[in-house]
Structure formats: structure tokens, C-alpha cells
Interface confidence: medium
């Protein structure tokens, strides 16, 4: 004869409020006759939840019919979960006896606790910009979850970091937690179109993690390189001179030409380019009117950044007296 | 699944412009820059510039600055090249395709080209 | 601008043959090199990234090798699907594709 064994599957059940809730349970073997019940709980303290033959339990419902002979599936479903529903499950076996039925053997338990979905990991970045080289902080924060046990990971880009600190709130029992990391990640140059990624995984989430961004072009700032040059060709009585502002990020620039120490009001012409990077490449062109009075112009062209302190390049125009000559007979 | 669809194939005379679109599906859009390349009958490859489709930033190939555009419109996951001033030896098979990282691994942030739209064919002829 | 030379131009195997294509550049490229196949009135489709990377998908008789200049693409075992134009493209510096070799049968 084939000993009786009470299986119920699942040692942990997450459960959400208002949902509800499957236990299940099989036996092995129709023998020894008797009733099989479900209670809350062990020893003289335990609480019955449904009983086939007797009482009245209106949130409880069979999954199988127990009427039927050959029934060995005795699962139930408890409707309307609330908070006060939490605890562990047995399913026990009880022996037909006279006076009374005697309990036969017990399952192992289903807990049965309350599951809540983490929300949405929200990331932050530093409120201001910094330049690359340097250590900037971001936080993640995930809230209303339950259990408390969970895995929070940080990644910059495809690249998994380790440089970051976790906490979860309360520490003691609760109904629900939060979760808060915050990670230290090194800006690159080329950290423009760079992403920080927390990725929380909870078992509430079967397995499909939930993530937050952050774009590090939010916390960057790629401050210009500058460089003033005088191009050889002359366009009738005019020199052509160039600023090149490069590599830089954000957008936010402004550039102006001073003649002499003198700021100039007339329009320039200039082309903004993006690098493959993100960042941008401004060059900006001055036209300078050449003459027998101008001996020594010096050019200044300087650029304020993301509101910075400006910089600035200066060039000594050289003009050669054949281009004097020949600026002087030239036609306007 | 991922990927890039282009318009149908065009017939232009000498002088005109061409427009030829190119529709993303299956990603984030503006997560990752498109490339236009072109391909002469019989001939090799040839890479006219990017599209970054978050910013609209863009870089052509010398060859081509001054004669092509670039642009996208992100609300319909769509990126444009129009080529200019069309000469017989225009006439090409013309390709978008998108990167295989959507981020900057390394200080150039250039990468390889994985996706590619099914190619459009531009005749210019008189 | 960094020049791609491909060699050769056109090479003729059989199947079940050991091919090798080779893709030399004007100056030091590292390992930034990708290889293309592209068959007639159809899109390049990406082999190999990084000089020695496979592409997800691609068959594993495929392989890159070199750094530097000098580069080669190697297919151990030619199979039917295999003939087709194979192109190295540069991307150290912007883009430049390889002028192409033609795998023919024999």
C-alpha cells in the first residue's frame, strides 16, 4: 500500500490585495478514508479555514469537486485578499475515527504573503553640470514593493558598475518597502550620449526587471577648445579669419569678435556641426578690412560656454605690405 | 523585429532633387544615429554622413557637404536624405542603415553599421 | 581620409573550400573593422565587427583576424549561400568601405 503524501507545491505565494489567492494540495492515495481540512497555522492555536462537511467559509472555494470518489486535488481559493489573510497554509489529512477524526498527516505549508510590485525606478541625476574626468553622483529610488528582499543593479551603458551604495526601508517588518541606491560614475568625453541604467529585479516581476534611465548628457558639460586662425587667401581688401570653438557640450554658446579691444557688432558668418560624440563644432569667420592706417590688429575672439567664464584666443593680423599695396589699389 | 523600410524607387532629370525616406520599427528611434550609403551599378559602397535622430545633428562626407540633407521627423520614426542638384552619376542604389551600439563605447563613438533599410534606387536620366 | 584596399578582386572556389580575403588600410586602424556580404539587388548584411567579432547570427565558419593594417575575413568551409561580394569598411576615422571582392564558384 502506498504511503499517503500531502504535496503542496509552492512554499511561497505573493499575493495582492483585493486578488485572489490559489492554495494547492494533493494527496498520493485515497487511504486512509477520511476528511482532508485547511488551517492558518500550527498547534492548538491554529485557525480553520475550510472544512468540506461542516461551517460556513463564503471566501473559500474547492478548485476540484470534493464530492467526486477518485478526487485527490483538495486546492482552494481564498477571494478578497486583505493584509489580515497573511500567514502559512496546511492542508491535514484526518483519519475517519469514532468518536472523532484524527489528524493523519500534514502538508508542508504554502506561506502566503502579501506581493507588491516595485514602481518604476526613478533616476537622478547632479543638479548641476560637471566636466568629464570628474565623479558625478546619481540616485535610483523604487518604492511600495514587498517582500522586502530585491537586487538593484547600476549599469553605464552595456558596463555592470560596482562604485554604488543600497538601502532599503524600514528594516523591520512592514507592509511595504523602498529602495535607494546611489551610484558614483566617472563622466568620459565622450559621455554625451551615454546612459545610466538602475535595474531592479523583485520576484513580484517574474524574472522582467523594471529599469530607469538617465542621460549623461544632463550632467555633463564638454567645455570648448578655441583656435584663432588667418587664412592665406585675401578676398579683394578683406583677410579672412576663423575661430574654431570645438568639441563642446551643451549648445549653449556665445561668441564674440573684438577688434583691438574693441567688441564688433557686425554680423559674421558661421556653421554649427555635431560630432559623432554629441558634442559640437562652431566655427565662426570675421572679415577684416585691410588699410594703410591698420598696422597692428590684433583679433580677439572669445566664448562664453554654458554661462562659464569666458575664453578667449587672440591673433595678431599679419598683414604684409604687398597686401597693403595691393588692398589700397584694390577696387571696393 | 527591428527594422529600417525605404521608399520606392525615383526617376529624376538632371538638376532636380531627390528625397528618399527611411522608416525605423522594433527600437528606440532616436537612440541610435542612421547612415546613408550609396551604391553605384556595379560599384562599391560609398558613406555619405549620419543623422544623430535625437538631436537632428548631422555630418556628411566631404564629398557631399553642401549638396545633401538630412533630416528626420521622430514623431513618425522616419529619417530623410535629400540630395541635390542631380548629375547622371547619381544614379544609385541609395541605403540607410542603423548602428549596432546606440551608445559612445569609445572616444570616436563611431561603430558598425548592422541594420539596413531594403536600399532605393534613383535613376537620373535626361 | 584612411584608404581600404581589398584583395583580390574577384576569387573563384568551390564548395566545401577554405577562402581567405584580405583588407589592408592606408594607416593603423586598430580593430576597428567590420566586414559586410552582400548579394545581388539585396542590402550588405554585417559579419564581423571589431576585426574578429561575430555577428549574431552568422554561421561560425566565418572568421575575422588582424589589427593594425593589415586584416583578413576566412571562411572555413565555402557552403552554396556563401558566394557573394564581401566588403571590409573601416571606422576609425568616419567611414570608408573596401572596393569589394567577388566570391565566384569555380
Known amino acids: 500500500e502506498e504511503e499517503l503524501q500531502m504535496i503542496q507545491p509552492e512554499k511561497l505565494l505573493l499575493v495582492t490585495v483585493g486578488k485572489t489567492a490559489t492554495l494547492h494540495c494533493t494527496v498520493t492515495s485515497l487511504l486512509p478514508v477520511g476528511p482532508v481540512l485547511w488551517f492558518r497555522g500550527v498547534g492548538p492555536g491554529r485557525e480553520l479555514i475550510y472544512n468540506q462537511k461542516e461551517g460556513h467559509f463564503p471566501r473559500v472555494t474547492t478548485v476540484s469537486d470534493l464530492t467526486k470518489r477518485n478526487n485527490m486535488d483538495f486546492s482552494i481559493r481564498i477571494s478578497s485578499i486583505t493584509p489580515a489573510d497573511v500567514g502559512t497554509y496546511y492542508c491535514v489529512k484526518f483519519r475517519k475515527g469514532s468518536p472523532e477524526n484524527v489528524e493523519f498527516k500534514s502538508g508542508p505549508g504554502t506561506e502566503m504573503a502579501l506581493g507588491a510590485k516595485p514602481s518604476a525606478p526613478v533616476v537622478l541625476g547632479p543638479a548641476a553640470r560637471t566636466t568629464p574626468e570628474h565623479t558625478v553622483s546619481f540616485t535610483c529610488e523604487s518604492h511600495g514593493f514587498s517582500p522586502r528582499d530585491i537586487t538593484l543593479k547600476w549599469f553605464k551603458n552595456g558596463n555592470e558598475l560596482s562604485d554604488f551604495q543600497t538601502n532599503v526601508d524600514p528594516t523591520g517588518q512592514s507592509v511595504a518597502y523602498s529602495i535607494r541606491s546611489t551610484a558614483r560614475v566617472v563622466l568620459d568625453p565622450w559621455d554625451v550620449r551615454s546612459q545610466v541604467i538602475c535595474e531592479v529585479a523583485h520576484v513580484t516581476l517574474q524574472g522582467d526587471p523594471l529599469r530607469g534611465t538617465a542621460n549623461l548628457s544632463e550632467a555633463i558639460r564638454v567645455p570648448p577648445t578655441l583656435e584663432v586662425t588667418q587664412q592665406p587667401m585675401r578676398v579683394g581688401n578683406q583677410v579672412n579669419v576663423t575661430c574654431q570653438v570645438r568639441k563642446f557640450y551643451p549648445q549653449s554658446l556665445q561668441l564674440t569678435w573684438s577688434e583691438n579691444g574693441n567688441v564688433c557688432q557686425r554680423e559674421t558668418a558661421s556653421t554649427l556641426t555635431e560630432n559623432k560624440d554629441g558634442t559640437y563644432n562652431w566655427t565662426s569667420w570675421f572679415l577684416v578690412n585691410i588699410s594703410d592706417q591698420r598696422d597692428d590688429v590684433v583679433l580677439t575672439c572669445q566664448v562664453k560656454h554654458d554661462g562659464q567664464l569666458a575664453v578667449s584666443k587672440r591673433l595678431a593680423l599679419e598683414v604684409t605690405v604687398h597686401q597693403k599695396d595691393q588692398s589700397s589699389d584694390a577696387t571696393p | 523585429q527591428v527594422q529600417l523600410v525605404q521608399s520606392g524607387a525615383e526617376v529624376k532629370k538632371p538638376g532636380a532633387s531627390v528625397k528618399v525616406s527611411c522608416k525605423a520599427s522594433g527600437y528606440t528611434f532616436t537612440g541610435y544615429h542612421i547612415h546613408w550609403v550609396r551604391q553605384a551599378p556595379g560599384q562599391g559602397l560609398e558613406w555619405m554622413g549620419w543623422i544623430n535622430p535625437n538631436s537632428g545633428g548631422t555630418n556628411y562626407a566631404q564629398k557631399f557637404q553642401g549638396r545633401v540633407t538630412m533630416t528626420r521627423d521622430t514623431s513618425i520614426n522616419t529619417a530623410y536624405m535629400e540630395l541635390n542638384r542631380l548629375r547622371s552619376d547619381d544614379t544609385a542604389v541609395f541605403y540607410c542603415?542603423?548602428?549596432?551600439?546606440?551608445?559612445?563605447?569609445?572616444?570616436?563613438?563611431?561603430?558598425?553599421?548592422?541594420?539596413w533599410g531594403q536600399g532605393t534606387m534613383v535613376t537620373v536620366s535626361s | 581620409d584612411i584608404q581600404m584596399t581589398q584583395s583580390p578582386s574577384t576569387l573563384s572556389a568551390s564548395v566545401g573550400d577554405r577562402v581567405t580575403i584580405t583588407c589592408r588600410a592606408s594607416?593603423?586602424?586598430?580593430?576597428?573593422l567590420a566586414w559586410y556580404q552582400q548579394k545581388p539587388g539585396k542590402a550588405p548584411k554585417l559579419l564581423i565587427y571589431k576585426a574578429s567579432s561575430l555577428e549574431t547570427g552568422v554561421p561560425s565558419r566565418f572568421s575575422g583576424s588582424g589589427s593594425g593594417t593589415e586584416f583578413t575575413l576566412t571562411i572555413s568551409s565555402l557552403q552554396p549561400d556563401d558566394f557573394a561580394t564581401y566588403y571590409c569598411?573601416?571606422?576609425?576615422?568616419?567611414?570608408?568601405f573596401g572596393q569589394g571582392t567577388k566570391l565566384e564558384i569555380k
Open positions: 542603415a542603423r548602428e549596432r551600439v546606440g551608445y559612445c563605447s569609445r572616444p570616436s563613438c563611431l561603430d558598425d553599421l548592422n541594420i
Open positions: 569598411q573601416q571606422y576609425d576615422s568616419y567611414y570608408t
Open positions: 594607416q593603423s586602424i586598430s580593430s576597428w
